[in-house]
């Protein structure tokens, strides 16, 4: 039963969330955002659709995730890029694709890159093309920190809930 | 000592798992599956071999992971694909490689893609070739949900415990 | 307030870490290492710089992470490789790039690959080039286990805190 073996206040919390089990008795901040497919030339994160969610204090403001409490968080993101048949014109030079998760903190007056992935694709040599990038890691974050992303190659994003996403959860 | 500072029932749980420490006092559902290397033209997940495991209620049925309790889970998977040395039959047509983690739930009458990665490789252009795909994210899952994978390019999988795997753990 | 609703010894622990909240009340072993950018032809992991850290018993010895307590850990790593601008000397021979997280345990007299990613790049065909590799998964580890990495293509690493990293955390 929910609350069995918990101290009174923890049991009360569990009763308020009847689906919880002992293994899940202390909720933790977590968020999973997806890229808005209706915005083709920008990457706008959405939390109120499909499988996306904000839990336990995480909020989305100015396209950034706001860290609710200090602690260690696992932060992750994925993008998928594609090029339709023969999109480049007079060049065989590669297309630079990159995706970065950045931290803006009261401790620093600039965006600090936390996670970066990069790729050169050669559209003139290989069309159509598809490329996926994923990264994630654990970081010590402070309440109020802002997590955002920067992407080179936004017009080439394959925007769907399972291909372009950004999230974090407290450890 | 295991169980110190825990309420009676939690201490009992800890005593039953003597290796546990306070930091690990509440076991959580977790699973890590590996692709069966003896099955070359299919991707069958195995839990009873190498580093693979099922813990705290996770089970494997019909090649799907069954979610034991409702909550937020981090779900992940990787595949590695390869193409052997140049074959005269290779053309300049691209080979579509994709790997997807899917959710089948009582809430939906179809498989919902949770994580998707895709790649085009050009065997005639680059032989031999190798490509890795990884993805993972946090999802709100319900007891009884089924997590499965779908892969395009199965004959090209490099099936080993460290290259092809699928897992999840409760947060 | 920290410690509210916790048993006495857990409350004492929380008071010693005043920034902690209920959701974070039991610290767990965690580590995040970054590749030393001053070492161009080797991959040396560093914990005392940038966003890197060792927490709750994790230590770094002989370029390996030492597992502090037995349990399930999520282990991850990323590398980014690059090839500089076009050189006429470049041939069409492929360059083999690979990154592996390995386990050395008292249970086995050899390094066991846990996570492996691989790629062939063709420098003569596509210059400049960039490629990212990421992987992570959950493993049952034992106190004293050593986690290390092996990389093919070290001279091509893009060594920065956000591109080359290695970490783990207890679940």
């Amino acid at each position: 039963l929910p609350g069995v073996g918990l101290t009174p206040s923890a049991a009360q919390t569990a009763r308020q969330h009847p689906k919880m089990h002992l293994a899940h008795s202390t909720l933790k901040p977590a968020a999973h955002l997806i890229g808005d497919p209706s915005k083709q030339n920008s990457l706008l994160w959405r939390a109120n659709t499909d499988r996306a969610f904000l839990q336990d204090g995480f909020s989305l403001s100015n396209n950034s995730l706001l860290v609710p409490t200090s602690g260690i968080y696992f932060v992750y993101s994925q993008v998928v890029f594609s090029g339709k048949a023969y999109s480049p014109k007079a060049t065989s030079s590669p297309l630079y694709l990159a995706h970065e998760v950045q931290l803006f903190s009261s401790q620093y007056p600039f965006h600090v890159p936390l996670l970066s992935s990069q790729k050169m694709v050669y559209p003139g040599l290989q069309e159509p093309w598809l490329h996926s990038m994923y990264h994630g890691a654990a970081f010590q974050l402070t309440q109020g920190d802002q997590l955002s992303t920067h992407t080179d190659g936004i017009p080439h994003l394959v925007l769907s809930p399972s291909t372009v996403f950004f999230g974090a959860f407290a450890l | 000592l295991p169980g110190v500072g825990l309420t009676p029932s939690a201490a009992q749980t800890a005593r039953q798992h003597p290796k546990m420490h306070l930091a690990h006092s509440t076991l959580k559902p977790a699973a890590h599956l590996i692709g069966d290397p003896s099955k070359q033209n299919s991707l069958l997940w195995r839990a009873n071999t190498d580093r693979a495991f099922l813990q705290d209620g996770f089970s494997l049925s019909n090649n799907s992971l069954l979610v034991p309790t409702s909550g937020i889970y981090f779900v992940y998977s990787q595949v590695v694909f390869s193409g052997k040395a140049y074959s005269p039959k290779a053309t300049s047509s691209p080979l579509y490689l994709a790997h997807e983690v899917q959710l089948f739930s009582s809430q939906y009458p179809f498989h919902v893609p949770l994580l998707s990665s895709q790649k085009m490789v050009y065997p005639g252009l680059q032989e031999p070739w190798l490509h890795s795909m990884y993805h993972g994210a946090a999802f709100q899952l319900t007891q009884g949900d089924q997590l499965s994978t779908h892969t395009d390019g199965i004959p090209h999988l490099v099936l080993s415990p460290s290259t092809v795997f699928f897992g999840a753990f409760a947060l | 307030l920290p410690g509210v609703g916790l048993t006495p010894s857990a409350a004492q622990t929380a008071r010693q870490h005043p920034k902690m909240h209920l959701a974070h009340s039991t610290l767990k072993p965690a580590a995040h290492l970054i590749g030393d950018p001053s070492k161009q032809n080797s991959l040396l992991w560093r914990a005392n710089t940038d966003r890197a850290f060792l927490q709750d018993g994790f230590s770094l010895s002989n370029n390996s992470l030492l597992v502090p307590t037995s349990g399930i850990y999520f282990v991850y790593s990323q590398v980014v490789f690059s090839g500089k601008a076009y050189s006429p000397k470049a041939t069409s021979s492929p360059l083999y790039l690979a990154h592996e997280v390995q386990l050395f345990s008292s249970q086995y007299p050899f390094h066991v690959p846990l996570l492996s990613s691989q790629k062939m790049v063709y420098p003569g065909l596509q210059e400049p080039w960039l490629h990212s590799m990421y992987h992570g998964a959950a493993f049952q580890l034992t106190q004293g286990d050593q986690l290390s990495t092996h990389t093919d293509g070290i001279p091509h690493l893009v060594l920065s805190p956000s591109t080359v990293f290695f970490g783990a955390f207890a679940l």
Epitope: T91, S92, Q126, D152 | - | -
Partner: antibody, heavy 115, light 113 residues
Amino acid sequence: QGQLQQSGAELMKPGASVKISCKATGYTFSSYWIEWVKQRPGHGLEWIGEISPGSGSTNYNEEFKGKATFTADKSSNTAYIQLSSLSTSEDSAVYYCADGYHGYWGQGTTLTVSS
Amino acid sequence: DIVMSQSPSSLAVSVGEKVTMSCKSSQSLLYSTNQKNFLAWYQQKPGQSPKLLIYWASTRDSGVPDRFTGSGSGTDFTLTISSVKAEDLAVYYCQQYYSYPRTFGGGTKLEIK
């Protein structure tokens, strides 16, 4: 529809250096290479080289190494070419930036080197 | 470096006439894997910057009138204007983007009689 807008004409002394800018508008240019092309009066087109604004990678025509240096500022969507040790006859020309991926060309910047 | 040679260097035609100009490369611009020729044609009108007309040897850029046609493969390429108009007065350049450095032909100057 994107376009490339170049800085205005320059009159420089021999031996000096000049920096010409090329601002991309209507699209984000970081993923696409910006090429630089030189055209002397009565001459054809010469390819100087290119820069990837996102990665910072560059490719130079050997004939312009040491003469031209490319930079880019992603935040302002602007690429630059710096020409050093200017000489009267060799460097006086119209300099164009171009994005071959989309087929965009700037309007050109006239550089006159005269004592 | 790949050398691009254009001919003739200039020609004068009347409005409505058909024009062809040639571009030859010192090595093949055909990429065998995708069967594409890495060649572009540009039009430069007096006092203006070059404008892309044709890429991949035969693909017209958007907005380019269909009287302009690119053809050829390997080392020999042709730009044809089926019925010249007065506004076609310009210098036409071919460019290879098969290898570095990119190189241009010397141009063909089209004059209207």
